[in-house]
């Protein structure tokens, strides 16, 4: 898996949408867990209803919220009051059994509101990047 | 009606390479994972790994990796285990299983089987 | 890889008898674990699936219980087609493990 970039603005929402294969992962649970360090364990920061058929509900664990359209197959986390102690690298997973397979590698990048620094018509409001060292999107 | 048919009895020589078959049919063999599992005479059941026809995603046991080859065919429905060198200890029989997820518990188990596949080994 | 042990390795039983056999899990498994029946030279058969779940067209006198490592597969009345192996399987993770296996023989 390449490492997908979403950037977001300290202080305000991130969405990080997870595509995946609606038949290939039917009925598995999904999750988002912190990845701690480069070979370290993911912890798992939040994940979907228990009951799979309830997926679609959203479940929220602090600032952050997970929510899953399984039948069109797109799992997302919404970061609320992006802080830049929330950087760094994430996975969304799909459970089974105690086993977790990698939907996709997230790396959230904070950038500092721009509003401290230039006038809000100059706003650009930033979300998903595949500039990091060329990710790409694996499906 | 869910089926899956696999090939038949093969005698083989040590050395020599086989590759046997399963054809599912009865459902969308495009949307469930099929296993490999081995019963040696008299023995219990071994999971071997497992194949997703529809993008050829596979995972193998650690005993099995490097001995076997998984793979499938999704415009015949068909999944394959291959062996590039048999050995005798390779006598057994073979069958493959579709792997349904449960949504009540998110985990897979083996709803439907093939018939099973007897391959011997011997000089 | 998780060891699944099944006992007893065999049991003599006759028609309309309770039998119970045990399948114990090297570490915890919370419900994963499914029962298959296999009758010689042919494929096994699912009976229970999430340690507790009936699959559909299996006789109700199949139940199964327990979580965490200890699992109980209780037949209610045997019937002369019941008399066939038992096996435990894990799907907790993997690789998928099963159990040796229980033989139900007539008495």
């Known amino acids: 898996h390449n490492t997908t970039v979403f950037q977001g603005v300290e202080g305000q929402s991130l969405q990080v949408s997870c595509p995946y294969d609606s038949m290939k992962h039917w009925g598995r649970r999904k999750a988002w867990c912190r990845q701690l360090g480069e070979k370290g364990p993911c912890q798992r920061v939040v994940s979907t209803h228990n009951l799979w058929l309830l997926s679609f509900l959203r479940r929220r664990n602090g600032s952050t919220a997970i929510t899953d359209d399984t039948l069109g197959g797109t799992l997302t986390i919404t970061l609320r009051n992006l802080q830049p102690h929330d950087a760094g690298f994430y996975q969304c997973q799909s459970l089974h059994g105690s086993e977790a397979d990698t939907l996709r590698k997230v790396l959230v990048e904070v950038l500092a509101d721009p509003l401290d620094h230039r006038d809000a018509g100059d706003l650009w409001v930033p979300g998903e990047s595949e500039s990091f060292e060329d990710a790409h999107v694996e499906h | 009606e869910v089926q899956l048919v696999q090939s038949g009895a093969e005698v083989k020589k040590p050395g020599e390479s086989l590759k046997i078959s399963c054809k599912g049919s009865?459902?969308?063999?495009?949307?469930?994972?099929i296993a490999w599992v081995r019963q040696m005479p008299g023995k219990g059941l071994e999971w071997m790994g497992i194949i997703y026809p529809g993008d050829s995603d596979t995972r193998y046991s650690p005993s099995f990796q490097g001995q076997v080859t998984i793979s499938a065919d999704k415009s015949i429905s068909t999944a394959y285990l291959q062996w590039s060198s048999l050995k005798a200890s390779d006598t057994a029989m073979y069958f493959c299983?579709?792997?349904?997820?449960?949504?009540?518990?998110?985990?897979?188990?083996?709803?439907?089987w093939g018939q099973g596949t007897l391959v011997t080994v011997s000089s | 890889d998780i060891q699944m042990t099944q006992s007893p390795s065999s049991v003599s039983a006759s028609v309309g008898d309770r039998v119970t056999i045990t399948c114990r899990a090297s570490?915890?498994?919370?419900?994963?674990l499914a029962w298959y029946q296999q009758k010689p030279g042919k494929a096994p058969k699912l009976l229970i699936y999430?340690?507790?779940s009936l699959q559909n067209g299996v006789p109700s006198r199949f139940s199964g219980s327990g979580s965490g490592t200890d699992f109980t597969l209780t037949i209610s009345s045997l019937q002369p087609e019941d008399f066939a192996t038992y096996f435990c399987?894990?799907?907790?993770?993997?690789?998928?493990?099963f159990g040796q296996g229980t033989k139900l023989e007539i008495k």
């Open positions: 399987q894990q799907a907790d993770s993997f690789p998928r493990t």
């Open positions: 999430a340690a507790s």
């Open positions: 570490q915890g498994i919370s419900s994963w």
């Open positions: 009865g459902y969308s063999f495009t949307s469930y994972w």
């Open positions: 299983a579709r792997q349904r997820t449960f949504y009540y518990d998110s985990s897979d188990y083996f709803d439907y």
